[in-house]
């Protein structure tokens, strides 16, 4: 267990031309707040998962009113750190999203209004217990400067916060099999604390709070012997009463979702669907009203003027969840039209279009034959988002603008000589061959391999190919 800490140093216009207009004005004073979302791993997959490592919302910053005519300065920031507690091991590699939100304090009907000013994202490697890491990220014309670190909560130590330390029981040495806890040499590594009730004989753990079973034992606490007989249950062959094989504990066992949240298993762990008024990885954050800005990703908050009344987030297309915190699996919607290939890069959606289609979502059919002229008597043939010209004899190229060299492909066989002709090509055949392309040998007795030669044509005469 531990805490990820984020310190925002500044948010203001980035270097270079095109400084952004101040987000606040005398008519519309405003204040900033920040949201951080953490996800484990560096994979593309992780980039669009929910904030599985946790999320945090900062306090509101001081109210700011733009001075008329002045360029947007660095804007006043909220006090303090953003802290994202993590219960399990620190993954070492993680993805982050930091959103800068503006709360407008003008005379809005129905309370203040929120809008997303900037969103930055990145993927980083970070060992727990290390020093503060500094970062600068740009979003459009804005620049965000910040530092972050991950630190373990005692008694956990180590780069992943998985080793546990306890003060030494004896001044000279640690217990059998336990090493000193560098850099805290006055402490000793403590044995892992497994899930409460985990069988000491048949269970073990590699992570705190875990209970893994030795062969032959099963159940959430490894107290059920595995039977060789087969039996069926909704989750496979399992039954605690008959001693059949039961799967290890599922991530939703014991429902980790607080406050009436419902748990659903995901390939990596679990996801809580929270009732209104609660959010967070385990629905542990409560007492939220619209004044807290609970709707993420541009969601519109309705109702909930006081802590006892619920709010509703109306999510923009592409987002879902009670707080609009979950992005729709965008590629599952098959957004790339006309057979395009979808790539969800996390920060953006990309479509790789089939030939003949273009646009961000392959929505632009490159119009086949519309407005497309084939020169020199060619005709346009449509097909699958592409067009081609079927050219008249003697012409070639994409638009039939090139004069074709009919002899370029060496069409005359057996050493025949090719001559370009206004209506095509002519082959002058070598002795012993005949045919339009000199493809037929003349038999030694003078008879050709053809059933009959065209009248008036001697073997060896030039043949015109029409």
């Amino acid at each position: 267990a531990g805490v990820f800490e984020l310190q925002i140093h500044s948010f203001g216009p980035g270097p270079g031309p095109g400084a952004p207009r101040s987000p606040c004005s005398a008519r519309l004073p405003c204040r900033l707040f920040f949201r951080v979302c953490l996800k484990p791993g560096l994979s593309e997959e992780a980039a669009e998962s929910p904030c599985a490592l946790g999320a945090a919302l900062s306090a509101r910053g001081p109210v700011y009113t733009e001075q008329p005519g002045a360029p947007a300065p660095d804007l006043p920031l909220p006090d303090g750190l953003l802290q994202v507690p993590f219960r399990d091991a620190w993954p070492g590699t993680f993805s982050f999203i930091i959103e800068t939100w503006r709360e407008e304090l003008g005379d809005q009907i129905g309370g203040p209004a929120w809008s997303l000013l900037a969103r930055v994202a990145g993927r980083r490697r970070l060992a727990a217990g290390g020093p503060w890491a500094r970062d600068i990220q740009r979003a459009g014309a804005w620049e965000l400067r910040f530092s972050y670190r991950a630190r373990c909560e005692p008694p956990a130590v180590g780069t992943a916060c998985t080793r546990l330390c306890r003060p030494r029981s004896a001044p000279s040495r640690c217990g059998p099999g336990l090493r000193p806890c560098a850099p805290l040499e006055d402490e000793c590594e403590a044995p892992l604390v497994c899930r409460a009730g985990c069988s000491p004989e048949h269970g073990f753990c590699e992570q705190p709070g875990e209970c893994r079973c030795l062969e032959g034992w099963t159940g959430p606490l490894c107290t059920v012997p595995v039977s060789t007989s087969s039996c069926l249950s909704p989750r496979g062959p399992s039954s605690a009463t008959t001693g059949c094989l039961v799967p290890g504990p599922g991530p939703c066992d014991g429902n980790p979702c607080a406050n009436g949240g419902s748990c659903s298993e995901t390939p990596r762990s679990f996801e809580c669907t929270c009732p209104r008024g609660f959010y967070g990885l385990r629905c542990e954050v409560s007492g939220v009203t619209c004044a807290d800005g609970p709707c993420f990703n541009g969601g519109l908050c309705v109702g909930g003027a006081d802590p006892d009344s619920a709010y509703i987030c109306h999510c923009p297309p592409g987002f879902q969840g009670s707080n609009c915190e979950k992005r729709v699996d965008r590629c599952s919607l098959q957004p790339c039209r006309n057979g395009g290939l979808c790539l969800d890069l996390g920060h953006a959606l990309r479509c790789r279009c089939r030939a003949g289609f273009a646009g961000p979502r392959c929505e632009h059919d490159l119009d086949d034959c519309a407005g497309r002229a084939c020169a020199n008597g060619g005709t346009c043939v449509e097909g699958g988002g592409a067009h081609r010209c079927s050219c008249a004899l003697g012409f070639g190229g994409r638009d039939c603008r090139e004069r074709a060299d009919p002899c370029a492909a060496r069409p005359c066989a057996h050493g025949g000589r090719c001559y370009a002709h206004f209506s095509g090509l002519v082959c002058a055949c070598a002795p012993g061959y005949m045919g339009a392309r000199c493809e037929f040998p003349v038999h030694p007795d003078g008879a050709s391999a053809l059933p009959a030669a065209p009248p008036g044509l001697r073997p060896g005469d030039p043949q015109r190919y029409l």
């Epitope: 997303l116 297309p317 965008r330 959606l349 929505e363 632009h364």
Partner: antibody, heavy 121, light 107 residues
Framework: EVQLVESGGGLVQPGGSLRLSCAAS????????IHWVRQAPGKGLEWVAY????????YYADTVKGRFTISRDNAKNSLYLQMNSLRAEDTAVYYC??????????????WGQGTTVTVSS | DIQMTQSPSSLSASVGDRVTITCRAS??????LNWYQQKPGKAPKLLIY???RLHSGVPSRFSGSGSGTDFTLTISSLQPEDFATYYC?????????FGGGTKVEIK
């Protein structure tokens, strides 16, 4: 609250020009593509033009291609439609409408109240 | 261009009636079909996107279905505020095209 407010409509002679504006508020303008859609008197809706969030992708209906130009100024939260060589058949109420967040659906999820363009001699 | 054909062009119904409007595309548009409602003198409003997804704030009596070329908008129990003109729009291939509209009038 998402708001789009069109302006710049009016009466113009055939062959003349007009510039429509659309002022946006209540959302992060630079995150969304915007459409212009028009409606001739007593008729249905006709899509006119589209510009993506960053202004890199621009599309026009064939009926206006070469005569109309769509543009945007994200710093001013504003969208524009420059209309040249106007014809009688361009007479309509012109609406600006916000596209969806990722251009996944090509919806028009919020609309302005419209501005009327009349082309007549 | 993809032609969108709506039927009927108008219909009369009473409050509480179940109303169905159909929209046919001239070629496959998968599920990229959106429905809008427009009242006289007002701007259109998005009701349903991606064939069946309700836009925020739209009552659940509105529903959509279909795929490919044939789509349906259903109002399960018509309310007084539902008397309006409804348009379908395809978002699959440029240019974006609308159906001709279906006017729902009071019987």
């Amino acid at each position: 609250e998402v708001q789009l407010v069109e302006s710049g409509g009016g009466l113009v002679q055939p062959g003349g020009s007009l510039r429509l504006s659309c002022a946006a508020s209540g959302f992060t303008f630079s995150d969304y593509g915007i459409h212009w859609v028009r409606q001739a008197p007593g008729k249905g809706l006709e899509w006119v033009a589209y510009i993506s969030s960053g202004g890199y992708t621009i599309y026009y209906a064939d009926t206006v291609k070469g005569r109309f130009t769509i543009s945007r100024d994200n710093a001013k939260n504003s969208l524009y439609l420059q209309m040249n060589s106007l014809r009688a058949e361009d007479t309509a109420v012109y609406y600006c409408a916000r596209g969806d967040y990722d251009d996944i659906f090509y919806t028009m999820d919020y609309w302005g109240q419209g501005t009327t363009v009349t082309v007549s001699s | 261009d993809i032609q969108m054909t709506q039927s009927p062009s108008s219909l009369s119904a009473s409050v509480g009636d179940r109303v169905t409007i159909t929209c046919r595309a001239s070629r496959d548009i998968t599920k990229f079909l959106n429905w809008y409602q427009q009242k006289p003198g007002k701007a259109p409003k998005l009701l349903i996107y991606y064939t069946s997804r309700l836009h925020s704030g739209v009552p659940s009596r509105f529903s959509g279905s279909g795929s490919g070329t044939d789509f349906t908008l259903t109002i399960s129990s018509l309310q007084p505020e539902d008397f309006a003109t409804y348009y379908c729009q395809q978002g699959n291939t440029l240019p974006w095209t609308f159906g001709g509209g279906t006017k729902v009038e009071i019987k």
